[in-house]
Interface confidence: medium
């Protein structure tokens, strides 16, 4: 067993590790979410630029200083283009999120065009249809009971939009949608200890060809892709959606990272690689947005004044546009966008951010030199709740995102989508589908706490992403019933 004196020898301060678990006992035992544990570690050493911690037995560096973060994520990105998540590249492993730096470059060059404004405008009508169906469903349910568990409810909307926009699938029956959701839920919630194993023995999963994803999930995405490939006769259909891009890549047979342009760094587009991208788009497009919207609705229920301002803005914009929600009206709603940003400040979904040094690297402004392959971690949650950057951080306040306020803050004080070249490729898609749905909800309903609303909402310890423990229960009151 490696000894826990790595950081002491290098004069880097940090919390005392525990045998076997390092500093991650609570997350390894699933008592606390990893993001919450990282926030606690961030808060332990308020004067330090970096903190030496141990993920299980592996030494890692938790970076607190915003200037150092800027170097890692932007200025010295070449050194930190890897996320440092190593497991089998088979079975969904070579997806865009988890891919090493080279694979990511090859794929990222191809997938970035999916999310241009033009493509998003084309997808908007599909999102719109999904949102209308969703509102119809909520209205019908409302007649029976006005209380909803909005997190799992909103997953039905985001599942529809990602299925329609990325894969051209229409989940006609709620039953089909629920079946798909139940399978996909397993990825996010089934406690796999493979990640802890990787922390203890970096590279072991890769060597043993182990995946972190359940077989049932792998099979679901394989059959999903096989069906779509068959439907489109293996060729792009002209829809210009995610699946068409995949089919173009399939015809090419390989993609090259333009860093070298040589076949040495090309990636063969096998059906396995295709499944891996389908998987990451599905997960990224569905869970993150559903969780963000659920938290936003929660905060609106608890902050009726803010909700009133939002409803007034929605009503005004809809009135000026003949009651229609368009791609442009969503962008126009300034306060709505600020409320969305504030939601992501309080509930950044992907925690912590992680990078791996591809060579030895001196941390700017310190004497610390980290060795090649060291994992560097950043806690968005720690930063977002740091009173140094945000006054009264536990209070939901969209005005923090007034242009002047944003201008006063360090560019790295807000990290819900990561930062730099390897930030979230789908952030504009996520914002659009979320704000469209919230607009539709607020145009029809007022959100109020129910008798079961948890006012001290905890983070679910079992999920890999940040999410509400026990869901979020609120009442949706049809606005025609509200004077």
């Amino acid at each position: 067993m490696r000894t826990f004196n790595y950081w002491k020898k290098r004069n880097v301060r940090g919390p005392e590790p525990v045998v076997f678990f390092g500093n991650l006992k609570d997350s390894a035992l699933r008592k606390k979410n990893m993001g919450v544990v990282m926030e606690e570690l961030y808060n332990m050493f308020p004067e330090e630029k970096v903190i030496g911690i141990y993920r299980m037995t592996s030494p890692c560096l938790l970076v607190r200083d915003l200037d150092v973060i800027k170097h890692i994520m932007i200025k010295d990105f070449e050194v930190f283009s890897d996320r440092g998540v190593e497991f089998s590249k088979e079975g969904l492993g070579s997806n865009l999120f988890h891919a090493d730096g080279e694979t990511w470059r090859a794929l990222g060059n191809r997938f970035t065009p999916i999310f241009t404004s033009g493509k998003l405008k084309n997808m908007f009508y599909l999102m719109h249809e999904g949102a209308d169906n969703f509102i119809d469903h909520v209205s019908a349910e409302c007649e029976k009971n006005q209380e909803f568990e909005v997190h799992s409810l909103l997953q039905t909307y985001t599942m529809s939009t990602i299925a329609a926009c990325a894969f051209g699938i229409s989940y006609d029956s709620i039953g089909d949608k629920v079946k798909a959701l139940d399978i996909v839920d397993k990825i996010i919630s089934e406690p796999s200890y493979a990640i802890e194993l990787d922390m203890m023995y970096p590279g072991l999963l890769s060597k043993l060809n182990l995946s972190i994803f359940p077989t049932v999930v792998k099979n679901f995405f394989k059959s999903l892709v096989d069906n779509i490939v068959a439907q489109r006769n293996g060729k792009p259909s002209g829809r210009n959606d995610f699946m068409d891009l995949i089919l173009e890549l399939r015809q090419l047979g390989e993609v090259t990272s333009n860093k070298y342009g040589s076949s040495a760094s090309s990636l063969e587009i096998t059906d396995e690689v295709i499944c891996a991208q389908a998987f990451v788009f599905y997960i990224a497009g569905y869970e993150t947005s559903a969780t963000t919207m659920a938290y936003m609705i929660y905060q609106l229920a608890l902050n009726p004044d803010i909700q009133n301002k939002l409803i007034a803005e929605v009503d005004e914009v809809l009135k000026a546009n003949d009651g229609k929600v368009t791609y442009d009206t969503v962008k126009e709603m300034k306060y709505l966008n600020k409320a969305f940003d504030e939601t992501l400040r309080m509930y950044s979904i992907v925690e912590p951010l992680q990078r791996k040094a591809t060579r030895d690297y001196k941390i700017p402004g310190t004497d610390v030199v980290i060795e090649k392959d060291t994992i560097v971690l950043i806690s968005p949650r720690g930063i977002h709740y740091d009173p140094k950057y945000y006054d009264n951080p536990k209070q939901f306040n969209p005005d923090r995102f007034d242009a002047e306020e944003v201008g006063k803050r360090h560019p790295c004080a807000y990290l819900p989508f990561g930062l730099g070249q390897r930030n979230c490729i789908g952030m504009r898609f996520g914002r659009l589908q979320s704000l469209l749905c919230i607009t539709k909800i607020l145009s029809k309903f007022r959100i109020e706490p129910s008798k079961n609303t948890d006012r001290n909402l905890q983070v679910e310890p079992h999920r890999g992403l940040i999410g509400p423990k026990g869901g979020i229960r609120v009442n949706a009151i049809p606005r025609k019933l509200v004077s």
Epitope: E141, K144, N145, E147, F148, E149, V150, H151, S152, L153, L154, Q155, T156, I174, G175, V178, K179, L181, D182, I183, D185, K186, I188, S189, S450, N452, E460, H462, R463, K469, G470, G471, R473
Partner: nanobody, 119 residues
Framework: QVQLQESGGGLVQAGGSLTLSCAAS????????MGWFRQAPGKERELVAD????????YYSDSVKGRFTISRDNAKNTVYLEIDSLKPGDTAVYYC????????????WGQGTQVTVSS
Amino acid sequence: QVQLQESGGGLVQAGGSLTLSCAASGRTSRSYAMGWFRQAPGKERELVADIAWSDGRIYYSDSVKGRFTISRDNAKNTVYLEIDSLKPGDTAVYYCASRARGTVSYNYWGQGTQVTVSS
């Protein structure tokens, strides 16, 4: 249709513990989550805990946090409610019910099982 059958109720001494079971049959794929409710004489029926089949998401009402534990066995299509440190105030008929994703309208109900706590 989803059929639900509770069992495990009975007469217990205060301070004791009890595990209630609820077996689901029929079209269980229609059910996203199962909730346990209780209704004491002359009182409204109240939700005490709820668990999702697919992701195990758990909800407890404030009144029972810490003493009640809900769990599921997907292979057996059964949900359990373990009650510790029973108090006379826990005397009630306990019902299990099933609901669809997102809604809190429980659409299928069991017959209920009586739990009586004697001091």
